[in-house]
Each structure stands twice: as C-alpha cells, then as structure tokens.
Interface confidence: low
C-alpha cells in the first residue's frame, strides 16, 4: 500500500537533484583552484543532512550550518554584485567582469542555483512530487531557508562599494519582499560598507525616464541612509550596450551614457 504523501503547492525536487549537486560541486572545484580542497561528497552529505528526514516547513538556518562551514569561501568583499529580479543580466555581467561576484558565483550559490528540493518528515526520501510554496504553504521550507542563509552571509561579507542590479521594467523596481529587500539590504554592515550603488536596468529601447526617481528607489534610499550607508543610483538605459562596453571599454561608443 503506497504511503500517504503530503501534497504541497510548489513543484517537487528537481530531477536528479543529488547527481546535479555533486556534479556542480566537482565542476566548480575544478574551475576554482582556491576551492580544490573541498570534498564534494562531504558537501553533498551536509546538504542532504539539512533537509532529509525533516519536516519541509520546519527548516532552520541552523540546519544549514554544516554546509555553510564546508562552503566557506573568500570573495573580495569590495567586488560584490547583488541583484533583484534580473538574475540573467547580473550573471552575464560577472561572466564578463570576472573580478566581480554574484552569490551564484560562489560555491554554495552555484550548487543551488535554479534548483528545488525538499524531503519528508521521518523518512530518508527526497520528495520529487511537490515541495512547499513560500506563499501558499510555508516560508521555512528548505529552498527559502537556504537562500535566506547564504544571502545573509553574502551581504554581511560585503564592504566598500556594493552594487545591486535592479529590474526597471517591473512595477516595483525595489521590492521589500524580495531576497534583496528583505534579507540583503538589512545585513549590509554599516561599518564596512560605504555606499550601495543601484544600477536600474531599463527594458524599453526608447525609455529615457530617470528611474532613479522611482518611489521604490526612494524607499530603498531611505532604508539604506537610515542604516548609515550612502546611496547612489545609475540608470542603465541600454543593457546590451552596457555589456558590450564592459567587454570592450575602448570602444569609441562607450564614452557616452549607456
């Protein structure tokens, strides 16, 4: 008789999840010499240990501490790029600008990027059918708690000038409920971070508005200023040209505003 299984509102664990995590770990440690000491089997064991046999609505940051410890990594604290609702462009940017890092350029971020996972209380099974949805089911689910944990640590580590890429095409350019708005903003350390510089990415070809005047950007500025961190904002009117100019800064067309 098949055992009754909890039906959650969100998609189930990504197919071949253990294999994917292990393969990504091996690939990452091969590409990044400073992480060659990492034992990927131990990383997977720690990852698995964070959620297997645990109720998927009762996960805590504490559950992920063994994984955090194994994934400890040195990132230049003044080269951090945060992003909100514009992941692809942020990743394209750090692929070109190799000395800057998003969370997904670190080992732990790379392992989990775009994956879903959850287990079941009191069984060692991975649930491939469904996992809790953050809104409809519970916020303390394995995926949400993981990203909250690594995002908090990443923001805490930042120093000097921190950049954030924001999506100017959305109704809320800065969303207080996003990971950036709810976790990262509040974990930047005022003693280490001098300035948060927002890059607002425009979507429309003919969009010449100053989106730095958007009310949600003003709200972000207010939150940041109250935390004793300076705020600056730049419009990126042409993201395609912006990337091109990062690749080739000598191009004559790159002297004008992007």
């Amino acid at each position: 008789v098949p055992r009754w299984r909890q039906q959650w509102s969100g998609p189930g664990t990504t197919k071949r999840f253990p294999e994917t995590v292990l393969a990504r770990c091996v690939k990452y440690t091969e590409i990044h010499p400073e992480m060659r000491h990492v034992d990927c089997q131990s990383v997977w064991d720690a990852f698995k240990g964070a959620f297997i046999s645990k109720h998927p609505c009762n996960i805590t940051e504490e559950d992920y501490q063994p994984l955090m410890k194994l994934g400890t990594q040195t990132v230049p604290c003044n080269k951090i790029l945060l992003w909100s609702r514009i992941k692809d462009l942020a990743h394209q940017f750090t692929q070109v600008q190799r000395d800057m890092f998003t969370l997904e350029d670190t080992l732990l971020g790379y392992l989990a990027d775009d994956l879903t996972w959850c287990g079941e209380f009191n069984t060692s099974k991975i649930n491939y059918q469904s996992c809790p949805d953050w809104r409809k089911d519970c916020s303390n689910n394995p995926v949400s708690v993981f990203w909250k944990t690594v995002s908090r640590r990443f923001a805490e580590a930042a120093c000097d000038v921190v950049h954030v890429m924001l999506n100017g095409s959305r109704s809320k350019i800065f969303d207080k409920n996003s990971t950036f708005g709810s976790v990262e903003v509040h974990n930047l350390q005022p003693e280490k971070v001098q300035t948060l510089e927002a890059w607002v990415i425009h979507g429309g070809r003919e969009d010449s508005r100053d989106l730095c005047q958007d009310p949600t950007i003003k709200e972000l500025e207010s939150i940041i200023s109250k935390r004793n961190i300076q705020f600056s904002c730049k419009n990126i009117y042409r993201p395609d040209k912006f990337l091109q100019c990062v690749k080739n800064p000598e191009d004559s067309s790159c002297t004008s505003e992007i």
């Epitope: 410890k69 400890t72 990594q73 040195t74 990132v75 604290c77 003044n78 640590r153 990443f154 805490e156 580590a157 120093c159 000097d160 350390q189 005022p190 003693e191 280490k192 001098q194 200023s225 109250k226 935390r227 004793n228």
Partner: antibody, heavy 120, light 111 residues
Framework: QVQLVQSGAEVVKPGASVKMSCKAS????????MHWVKEAPGQRLEWIGY????????NYNQKFQGRATLTADTSASTAYMEISSLRSEDTAVYFC?????????????WGQGTLVTVSS | DIVLTQSPATLSLSPGERATISCRAS??????????MHWYQQKPGQPPRLLIY???SRATGIPARFSGSGSGTDFTLTISPLEPEDFAVYYC?????????FGGGTKLEIK
C-alpha cells in the same frame, strides 16, 4: 591627529540620569560612527552602541536599548551618551571610541573614559 | 549573542618568555575569508589599545613580538619575547555580529 576627550567623573544617585560627552578633533566628525563601551569593575567590556553623527542614526546593543540615549552635536563635534534610571550596576568607566574607518571596524581611537559612580 | 571565552584568566610569566592567550567564540566569527576578531591591551587607568585586527594583522605602531592567529571559533594572541611593559590585561573582541562582544580578559602578570 585624532583625539577623543571625555567629560569628567560623575557621582549620581540611584534612579537619576547622567549625561557625558566626548569631544572629537583631528578628523571629520560627521564621517565616522562614535561608539560607547562600558567597563564595570570585575566585568568584561561591553559595547553599548554607536551613533552616526552624519545623520543621527543609532544602533544599540539590545541590553542598553531604552536606558542609554546617544546623541551628537555636529557643530561642536561632540557626541553624548545619557543613561537614565541609574542603578548600582551602572557604576563603571564609560569610553567613547572610534573605528579606524571604512572596512576597519575595530576600535582604533579611544577617549580617556568617564567614571560614573552610582551611590546614595 | 556571540560569547567569547578567554583562557587563561591569569598568566604568570617572566620577561623574555612567551605568552599565549586563547579566545574561543561560541560560534564562528569568520565571514568569507575574514576572521572578525581583534585583540586589545589595557593598563590600569587607561583605555584599551588596539594590538591585532582581523585575527592576524598588527595595528600601526605595534611591535612585531605581538602576533595573532586563528580562524572560525579559535583565536590566539602570542607575545614573544615578553617585555616588562607587556604586563597588562588583554581582551579579544568580535564584530562579526551585533552586539559586538568582548572576552572576559586575561591578566598577564610578572612571575
């Protein structure tokens, strides 16, 4: 050079308040957080909190929230700490301290300390 | 709060000897390669003086006989060889997380 000069010793009664000052010189007062640290006899040093004189923003150790109030007068380059509802365990030397600057979040500069004695 | 436990509480040594003071944190004070642990020296009637910052960097003007090491939860301050002016109280301090906290202190006294 950076200097932090604190006000003189105070003897106060239980239940009263005390306000001490820390005058800064040798740097741009509005650009750095001013921290306060408590040294009570036989106890470990305790961080009370800081004020950012640039905009008056404060950050308190939860333990001192509500009884310690940090303020700053930018025109006089002076930071203040007021402690209310004093009790015997508030008898201590209170230091103001400044960090080394951006990415240097450790106390490089210290005032000479203000001794507060709570006694009836 | 992160609790810092220093040992020993008192250390009795002679000038010329080597002093080793330990500081253990209740949780890791590392963040992306930096150990947010600092060491101070305090003499009677004086404010603390910064010796070592970020676990192992010597502050300006601090002699080379002072060194710091460690990561995660375990940190060490070493003074070698001891000079007569080194006898004082030593504190560790973390600022990885609010509230910033100090160790209980180690009194280094002349034997």
């Amino acid at each position: 050079q950076v200097q932090l000069v604190q006000s003189g010793a105070e003897v106060v009664k239980p239940g009263a308040s005390v306000k001490m000052s820390c005058k800064a010189s040798g740097y741009t007062f509005t650009s750095f957080n001013m921290h306060w640290v408590k040294e009570a006899p036989g106890q470990r040093l305790e961080w009370i909190g800081y004020i950012y004189p640039g905009n008056g923003g404060t950050n308190y150790n939860q333990k001192f929230q509500g009884r310690a109030t940090l303020t700053a007068d930018t025109s006089a380059s002076t930071a203040y700490m007021e402690i209310s509802s004093l009790r015997s365990e508030d008898t201590a030397v209170y230091f103001c301290a400044r960090t080394g600057g951006l990415r240097r979040a450790y106390f490089t500069y210290w005032g000479q300390g203000t001794l507060v004695t709570v006694s009836s | 709060d992160i609790v810092l436990t220093q040992s020993p509480a008192t250390l009795s040594l002679s000038p010329g000897e080597r002093a080793t003071i330990s500081c253990r944190a209740s949780e890791s004070v590392d963040s992306y390669g930096n150990g947010f642990m600092h060491w101070y020296q305090q003499k009677p009637g004086q404010p603390p003086r910064l010796l070592i910052y970020l676990a192992s960097s010597r502050a300006t003007g601090i002699p080379a006989r002072f060194s710091g090491s460690g990561s995660g939860t375990d940190f060490t301050l070493t003074i070698s060889p001891l000079e007569p002016e080194d006898f004082a109280v030593y504190y560790c301090q973390q600022n990885k997380e609010d509230p910033w906290t100090f160790g209980g202190g180690t009194k280094l006294e002349i034997k």
